[in-house]
């Protein structure tokens, strides 16, 4: 009977118990982007550092070719921050001349790709107009939320303009996910 | 045999099971900073409320002298928001006179200190140029991500200008961490 | 003895073990808001999609009438992003005429309502001055943190101006919570 004493109650064990330390997890950090061919009508995807410095993947969560590969179905918390930097946006210069115009903008999208589904799914989007008055500018966009993912799903981070991404420090631009 | 029925499967028990409710967790909230001596060449660290209102520390996660002390090795989700407020940035005044200049900025860094390691490690940084056109301005910087921490590590939040932090409400400026 | 081998150690079982997959969780997404009566001196609450597209509620976490209902006491991670969009703020026009003035602003508040307590509690606030120089503008405010909640607590998201919320895409404006 002693063995039963510490077993989880009958009510709780329909879903299997599992140790937290063996759950799929990843934190990826920015690397300098090399010019690549982008898909037409789709924001370019960032590629990432997955093992040096603060970056890691563990427990079957793998990174390959700009994608985080989901090894197990479940609810995941997914997050990313992208820090952008640029020179004066043309938007403000044009506006100063008295002509209204569409503002410049910066956008981050966390996208899910499911092989059995033809179109990628946009999970999270952060988008911001940038109409700075002169000088250099820099700012982060942060995103994070929980999603139900299936084994084999792939996650990537797309940005509106890859050349504006601040790739200088691993703490400024990053991407991660963990099974809850 | 009955005792074995609900025991986790052999595959799952190499890492010990543990109840979620006993994991180290903390949510700290802003208090007014009093002028102090800052370390040279390092952004000043904020100090925090750890037990009143919405703030708490639990399960051996302790707060002391501006630091959250990590009581157990593992993967932690760490987050902070700092709301800044200020008057017109000098930057915009200079720019209006037609001279380009380096913008004012606001920065938040979540830093890890490991006693056995000489240099602090910057885990997360949010940095934003502030070139407001006149009037008062206010805005938050939010950060959050997962990191592998070791027992004894210490976490702090550093800011570029402590006097611009909005200390008025516990929901505007905060810092937290929890073991996954 | 075999049954005991994989049972959690004595130290770990005072808090009941439970499967992660059966914890209360929700991710709600934006829907177009219909004009409603707002409480005086309180920002209006958003209502949400809870089952279509990326939205879901599970394990007794229910959504009803703008509220997420907490079904079980514990520590929850709560998050929201609201994307705002608008035309040129009056603030900048007045300022250009040389008169200083109070800036326009956008604010998101995640609020907890406890039936036994007369006043709602503001858990999280993101507030930002908006003084754009001409043109349209758009930008997100993101919030997320951990709180100790009680069974029966209700969560809502309030915004300073419901008419500025971008309701066009489920990835731009969302609200979620999950038991840790």
């Amino acid at each position: 009977l002693k063995g039963q004493e510490f077993a989880p109650s009958h009510q709780q064990v329909y879903a299997p118990l599992r140790a937290d330390g063996d759950k799929p997890r990843a934190h990826l950090t920015v690397v300098r982007q090399t010019p690549t061919q982008h898909f037409k009508n789709q924001f370019p995807a960032l590629h990432w550092e997955h093992e040096l410095g603060l970056a890691f993947t563990k427990n079957r969560m793998n990174y390959t070719n700009k994608f985080l590969l989901i090894p197990e179905s479940g609810d995941y918390f997914i997050y990313s921050q992208v820090t952008f930097r640029g020179m004066t946006s043309e938007c403000s210069e044009i506006r100063q001349a008295g002509r209204p115009n569409k503002p410049d903008s910066i956008t981050v999208v966390i996208t899910k790709v499911t092989d059995s589904y033809p179109e990628p799914t946009q999970l999270l989007m952060g988008t911001k107009s940038v109409c700075e008055v002169g000088s250099n500018w820099f700012q982060p966009i942060y995103l994070g939320a929980m999603f139900s993912l299936q084994e084999g799903d792939k996650l990537m981070v797309n940005v509106s303009d890859i050349s504006l991404v601040d790739y200088t420090k691993e703490d400024k631009t990053f991407f991660g996910a963990f099974l809850l | 045999l009955k005792g074995q029925e609900f025991a986790p499967s052999h595959q799952q028990v190499y890492a010990p099971l543990r109840a979620d409710g006993d994991k180290p967790r903390a949510h700290l909230t802003v208090v007014r900073q009093t002028p102090t001596q800052h370390f040279k060449n390092q952004f000043p660290a904020l100090h925090w409320e750890h037990e009143l209102g919405l703030a708490f520390t639990k399960n051996r996660m302790n707060y002391t002298n501006k630091f959250l002390l990590i009581p157990e090795s593992g993967d932690y989700f760490i987050y902070s928001q700092v709301t800044f407020r200020g008057m017109t940035s000098e930057c915009s005044e200079i720019r209006q006179a037609g001279r380009p200049n380096k913008p004012d900025s606001i920065t938040v860094v979540i830093t890890k200190v490991t006693d056995s390691y000489p240099e602090p490690t910057q885990l997360l940084m949010g940095t934003k140029s502030v070139c407001e056109v006149g009037s008062n301005w206010f805005q938050p910087i939010y950060l959050g991500a997962m990191f592998s921490l070791q027992e004894g590590d210490k976490l702090m939040v550093n800011v570029s200008d402590i006097s611009l932090v909005d200390y008025t409400k516990e929901d505007k400026t905060f810092f937290g961490a929890f073991l996954l | 003895l075999k049954g005991q081998e994989f049972a959690p150690s004595h130290q770990q079982v005072y808090a009941p073990l439970r499967a992660d997959g059966d914890k209360p969780r929700a991710h709600l997404t934006v829907v177009r808001q219909t004009p409603t009566q707002h409480f005086k001196n309180q920002f209006p609450a958003l209502h949400w999609e809870h089952e279509l597209g990326l939205a879901f509620t599970k394990n007794r976490m229910n959504y009803t009438n703008k509220f997420l209902l907490i079904p079980e006491s514990g520590d929850y991670f709560i998050y929201s992003q609201v994307t705002f969009r608008g035309m040129t703020s009056e603030c900048s026009e007045i300022r250009q005429a040389g008169r200083p003035n109070k800036p326009d602003s956008i604010t998101v508040v995640i609020t907890k309502v406890t039936d036994s307590y007369p006043e709602p509690t503001q858990l999280l606030m993101g507030t930002k001055s908006v003084c754009e120089v001409g043109s349209n503008w758009f930008q997100p405010i993101y919030l997320g943190a951990m709180f100790s909640l009680q069974e029966g607590d209700k969560l809502m998201v309030n915004v300073s101006d419901i008419s500025l919320v971008d309701y066009t895409k489920e990835d731009k404006t969302f609200f979620g919570a999950f038991l840790l």
């Epitope: - | 009093t34 002028p35 200390y167 409400k169 | -």
Partner: antibody
Framework: QVQLVQSGAEVKKPGASVRVSCKAS????????MHWVRQAPGQGLEWMGW????????NYAQKFQGRVTVTRDTSISTAYMELSRLRSDDTAVYYC???????????WGQGTMVTVSS | DIVMTQSPSSLSASVGDRVTITCRAS??????LNWYQQSPGKAPKILIY???RLQSGVPSRFSGSGSGTDFTLAISSLQPEDFATYYC?????????FGPGTKVDIK
């Protein structure tokens, strides 16, 4: 400990200028705004302006614009307030004050009495 | 400029009394309201910041409330050292402005 020490009392003639110094110690001088507040005899408190010791940027109350100049010397952690074209109603105790945020005042100097009299 | 008004301008009370002082701003100042105590011949001392938050080291008998335009300072049980002048100050926008003060003296 954290303190602000001001220069001594001054007696000035109308039309003259006065310069009051404020030496900070026990904290990082460049990390916190320094303000000047005055109090006429038997009257309330009146904010004059601030300096950001880090950047040197200033902000003055309109009432004193053109007459007041606040400066600092970071090498000796000292702020200065100069008020020109003195009038008899400038007779007051002048305080330097700083705080953990730019909009409130935790630490105060002991005050400097400036008397303007012909 | 934001104009701050206080009432009453003076009050007489006894040790142990509960005292309340009100402060009103001419326009909304959110929670950017601070309270100071000044004893004769001394520099002011901050008591309450952010309208309702007690400055470290200040006795808990002092409390503040309010937001927007209307604010209150309360002293739950007056002590001999509390007889002084109390000022409110707005930190919402420059020029920062103080109320005219409320003098609390012994009845």
């Amino acid at each position: 400990q954290v303190q602000l020490v001001q220069s001594g009392a001054e007696v000035k003639k109308p039309g003259a200028s006065v310069r009051v110094s404020c030496k900070a110690s026990g904290y990082t001088f460049t990390g916190y705004y320094m303000h000047w507040v005055r109090q006429a005899p038997g009257q309330g408190l009146e904010w004059m302006g601030w300096i950001n010791p880090n950047s040197g940027g200033t902000n003055y109350a309109q009432k004193f614009q053109g007459r007041v100049t606040v400066t600092r010397d970071t090498s000796i952690s000292t702020a200065y307030m100069e008020l020109s074209r003195l009038r008899s109603d400038d007779t007051a105790v002048y305080y330097c004050t700083s705080g953990g945020s730019f909009d409130a005042f935790d630490i105060w100097g002991q005050g400097t009495m400036v008397t303007v009299s012909s | 400029d934001i104009v701050m008004t206080q009432s009453p301008s003076s009050l007489s009370a006894s040790v142990g009394d509960r005292v309340t002082i009100t402060c009103r701003a001419s326009q909304s100042i959110s929670s950017f309201l601070n309270w100071y105590q000044q004893s004769p011949g001394k520099a002011p001392k901050i008591l309450i910041y952010g309208a309702s938050r007690l400055q470290s080291g200040v006795p808990s008998r002092f409390s503040g409330s309010g937001s927007g335009t209307d604010f209150t300072l309360a002293i739950s049980s007056l002590q001999p050292e509390d007889f002084a002048t109390y000022y409110c100050q707005q930190g919402d926008s420059t020029p920062f402005t103080f109320g005219p003060g409320t003098k609390v003296d012994i009845k």
